[in-house]
Amino acid sequence: GLLELAGTLDCVGPRSPMAYMNYGCYCGLGGHGEPRDAIDWCCYHHDCCYSRAQDAGCSPKLDRYPWKCMDHHILCGPAENKCQELLCRCDEELAYCLAGTEYHLKYLFFPSILCEKDSPKCN
């Protein structure tokens, strides 16, 4: 769920989850076009991860999952079902992906009209 997503980003850092609310073409709601930078690519891969989970019958925004934060590390589980495991893994990958990136203010509140119609294929 969205609470867990925000929590995992907070856990790993280095920025507030709010920094990604509307960044580039993929950080925030929806997404299309070519990802703008490393942060945007992280969000793009996270969207793909959620799409795969959704195709498997999970509800990324509805399915809450148990997890713990220890020393800026995410510990997923214990999961009650496979969706909890998959979604925690998606959020964990995003958090670690974002941790090693450089932030570009020019992509904050990036107008979606500047994002191309076509998106890269999820692998």
Epitope: G57, C58, S59
Partner: antibody, heavy 118, light 107 residues
Framework: QVTLKESGPGILHPSQTLSLTCSFS??????????VGWVRQPSGKGQEWLAH???????YYNPPLKSRLTISKDPSKNQVFLTIPNVNTANTATYYC??????????WGQGTTLTVSS | DIQMNQSPSSLSASLGDTITISCHAS??????LSWYQQKPGNIPKLLIY???NLHTGVPSRFSGSGSGTGFTFTISSLQPEDIATYFC?????????FGGGTKLELK
């Protein structure tokens, strides 16, 4: 069209090992999000979930039965296997193979009946 | 394990009737409830998943609702081919657990 078919011994004596095979078609167990599970139903009673195995080889066993069950798969042959050693009369039931997604059972096999009798 | 309490265990109805079956979970299962139909000597068939979503090819006279711990399954305008046993299943927490079933008969 998804189909699953169970095969088993039909009759066993107490202390023997039950080996069940589920042969399926219409899907691949290499597909993200899919699993195959086993359910049993003693005559006139409710269903009991036994175990399931996922596309990524993650396995789940119903905790009270965990030490007695082994589930495995051969995706290349579209087969899943369940073994229960040392059966007794409490294992008399119809055993169903199912195709599962993380939150529900999508398809069921026709079931195979096991009678444990001395 | 999550207990699923299904009622009634049997039900008599006439063709054209609307019938309702209930399923109660012992703890919150969100919307992760499915409904199945099993005719004598036949394979159980998924009718509804995620509380209210109709599985492919299932007629629209079947419907489901509910969330949390209380769920309802409805057949509007009962047809002869609907005579069967219906059961629910929770998918929030493994092991999957099932309701005891409702045997539907013609009056």
């Amino acid at each position: 069209q998804v189909t699953l078919k169970e095969s088993g011994p039909g009759i066993l004596h107490p202390s023997q090992t039950l080996s069940l095979t589920c042969s399926f078609s219409g899907f691949s167990l290499n597909t993200f999000g899919l699993g195959v599970g086993w359910v049993r139903q003693p005559s006139g009673k409710g269903q009991e979930w036994l175990a399931h195995i996922w596309w990524d080889d993650d396995r789940y066993y119903n905790p009270p039965l965990k030490s007695r069950l082994t589930i495995s798969k051969d995706p290349s042959k579209n087969q899943v296997f369940l073994t229960i050693p040392n059966v007794n009369t409490a294992n008399t039931a119809t055993y169903y193979c199912t195709q599962i997604l993380p939150h529900w059972v999508a398809y069921w096999g026709q079931g195979t009946t096991l009678t444990v009798s001395s | 394990d999550i207990q699923m309490n299904q009622s009634p265990s049997s039900l008599s109805a006439s063709l054209g009737d609307t019938i309702t079956i209930s399923c109660h979970a012992s703890q919150n299962i969100n919307v992760w409830l499915s409904w199945y139909q099993q005719k004598p000597g036949n394979i159980p068939k998924l009718l509804i998943y995620k509380a209210s979503n109709l599985h492919t090819g299932v007629p629209s006279r079947f419907s489901g609702s509910g969330s949390g711990t209380g769920f309802t399954f409805t057949i509007s305008s009962l047809q002869p081919e609907d005579i069967a046993t219906y059961f629910c299943q929770q998918g929030q927490s493994y092991p999957f657990t099932f309701g005891g079933g409702t045997k539907l008969e013609l009056k």
